[in-house]
Interface confidence: low
């Protein structure tokens, strides 16, 4: 069977959030299959998603070997009834991908908050990366260290003027007006990046001074 029976993959796209990384491409194959290969810069090609009819491939385990490395993937097209030969199948290269720089930051979750008098304490959940090391899920800060900041946007519930605070931990302690209710959201930020600097903002939470001043949000977080 000749290579004219296959279509070369196109629109190769990296979809990556908090290091969970999937390569997507087109088109859906008919009577042929794909194999994905991934390689660090100047490294050897490694087969992933061997002879698949999918148009996506999870390469998280490969890119996590060194998230500072730059990777290239390629999608090879084979006839469905292919017999392995020395002839190289047609393929398309992906754009380069550097996980540390290019993975998108996922939407953060406000874990808890407490307003006591003129102080508002907000804690951001330690986001997991969906990647395991020795059976333990890595947290976002495990990978980004000092590079990971959070921005808190907060405002009086009775007004629209937003204020901003920044931390390189997962906690904020800010001054507020006693007796006033405040609403707020948080955003993960990596200032040192040129692109993909910011995550989506979290869901908005609000204090309620006539009710309990301290609460966990509905997103329960299990501490290690």
């Amino acid at each position: 069977t000749g290579t004219t029976d296959v279509i070369v993959a196109y629109n190769l796209t990296w979809k990556s959030t908090n290091f969970k990384t999937i390569l997507e491409w087109e088109p859906k194959p008919i009577n042929y299959v794909y194999t994905v290969q991934i390689s660090p810069r100047l490294g050897d090609w490694k087969n992933k998603c061997f002879h698949t009819t999918d148009t996506e491939c999870d390469v998280t385990d490969e890119i996590m070997r060194n998230v500072k490395e730059t990777y290239v993937a390629r999608v090879l097209s084979y006839p469905a009834d292919t017999v392995l030969t020395a002839q190289e199948p047609p393929f398309t290269n992906s754009p380069p991908f550097t996980p540390y720089l290019d993975t998108n930051l996922g939407q953060p979750v406000i874990q808890s908050f407490e307003q006591v008098g003129t102080k508002l304490n907000v804690t951001v959940e330690a986001a997991r990366t969906l990647v395991r090391v020795n059976g333990t899920f890595l947290r976002l800060r495990d990978v980004f260290g000092k590079d990971l900041n959070y921005t808190l946007y907060y405002w009086r519930a009775s007004s629209t003027g937003k204020k901003k605070a920044t931390t390189n931990t997962n906690e904020f302690l800010i001054d507020v007006d006693k007796g006033e209710n405040y609403c707020f959201s948080v955003q993960a930020v990596i200032p040192s990046r040129r692109v993909n600097q910011k995550s989506p903002e979290s869901r908005i939470e609000c204090t309620s001074q006539e009710k309990a001043v301290s609460r966990e949000t509905g997103h329960h977080h299990h501490h290690h």
């Epitope: 060194n66 998230v67 500072k68 090391v133 020795n134 890595l138 947290r139 800060r141 495990d142 260290g145």
Partner: antibody, heavy 123, light 108 residues
Framework: QVQLVQSGAEVKKPGASVKVSCKAS????????ISWVRQAPGQGLEWMGW????????NYAQKLQGRVTMTTDTSTSTAYMELRSLRSDDTAVYYC?????????FGYGMDVWGQGTTVTVSS | DIQMTQSPSTLSASVGDRVTITCRAS??????LAWYQQKPGKAPKLLIY???SLEYGVPSRFSGSGSGTEFTLTISSLQPDDFATYYC??????????FGGGTKVEIK
């Protein structure tokens, strides 16, 4: 304040083992990695390895593989470095240091250091 | 393994001098480099991380630059407290995270 306090000096015979401890205080122990670095008399710094208290993940320098084991006890915020089959060229000051990367020792440098533990290997 | 080469190995200078220390990597390490200062009998102290980011509390007379394979640590005006040995360390690849051989800055 943030500090790492190491165990005292040790004198060992060739072929023996040594276990150096490093107790952390003033910060969340499992939010950082711990690196171990040694310095032979009059020599430069040598990176020995690293451990993440959070995950137990370790990286060791190839030349020490099989002889070194790094562990942590999160209940006491203490890191340990054990070196076996000691030789005279293992005589050095051994430092533990805090590393901001806890998945892999990333390039933020080691920002807090222990005072050092002198290990002398002599027959 | 990536080799880190520092030069010079010894540098004689006077208070007020501008001092530059070079660190070369045997292959590209992007900007994954840290600089340390060490005084006799003491533990090293972090000065610079990620090639040019000044560690908190370190005087602004220290600065780092470079990317790829060539990096420099500059002390804009040498102070009496700065006479020490300086080391670079790379973090780009998997272990070992090698140090340079050190540069001793001594009084001229």
């Amino acid at each position: 304040q943030v500090q790492l306090v190491q165990s005292g000096a040790e004198v060992k015979k060739p072929g023996a083992s040594v276990k150096v401890s490093c107790k952390a205080s003033g910060y969340t122990f499992d939010a950082y990695g711990i690196s171990w670095v040694r310095q032979a008399p009059g020599q430069g710094l040598e990176w020995m390895g690293w451990i993440a208290p959070y995950s137990g993940n370790t990286n060791y320098a190839q030349k020490l593989q099989g002889r070194v084991t790094m562990t942590t006890d999160t209940s006491t915020s203490t890191a340990y470095m054990e070196l076996r089959s000691l030789r005279s060229d293992d005589t050095a000051v051994y430092y533990c240091a805090r590393d901001a990367g806890t998945y892999s020792p990333f390039g933020y440098g080691m920002d807090v250091w222990g005072q050092g533990t002198t290990v002398t290997v002599s027959s | 393994d990536i080799q880190m080469t520092q030069s010079p190995s010894t540098l004689s200078a006077s208070v007020g001098d501008r001092v530059t220390i070079t660190c070369r990597a045997s292959e590209s390490i992007s900007n994954w480099l840290a600089w340390y200062q060490q005084k006799p009998g003491k533990a090293p102290k972090l000065l610079i991380y990620k090639a040019y980011s000044l560690e908190y509390g370190v005087p602004s007379r220290f600065s780092g630059s470079g990317s790829g394979t060539e990096f420099t640590l500059t002390i804009s005006s040498l102070q009496p407290d700065d006479f020490a040995t300086y080391y670079c360390q790379q973090f780009q690849k998997l272990p070992p995270f090698t140090f340079g051989g050190g540069t001793k800055v001594e009084i001229k």
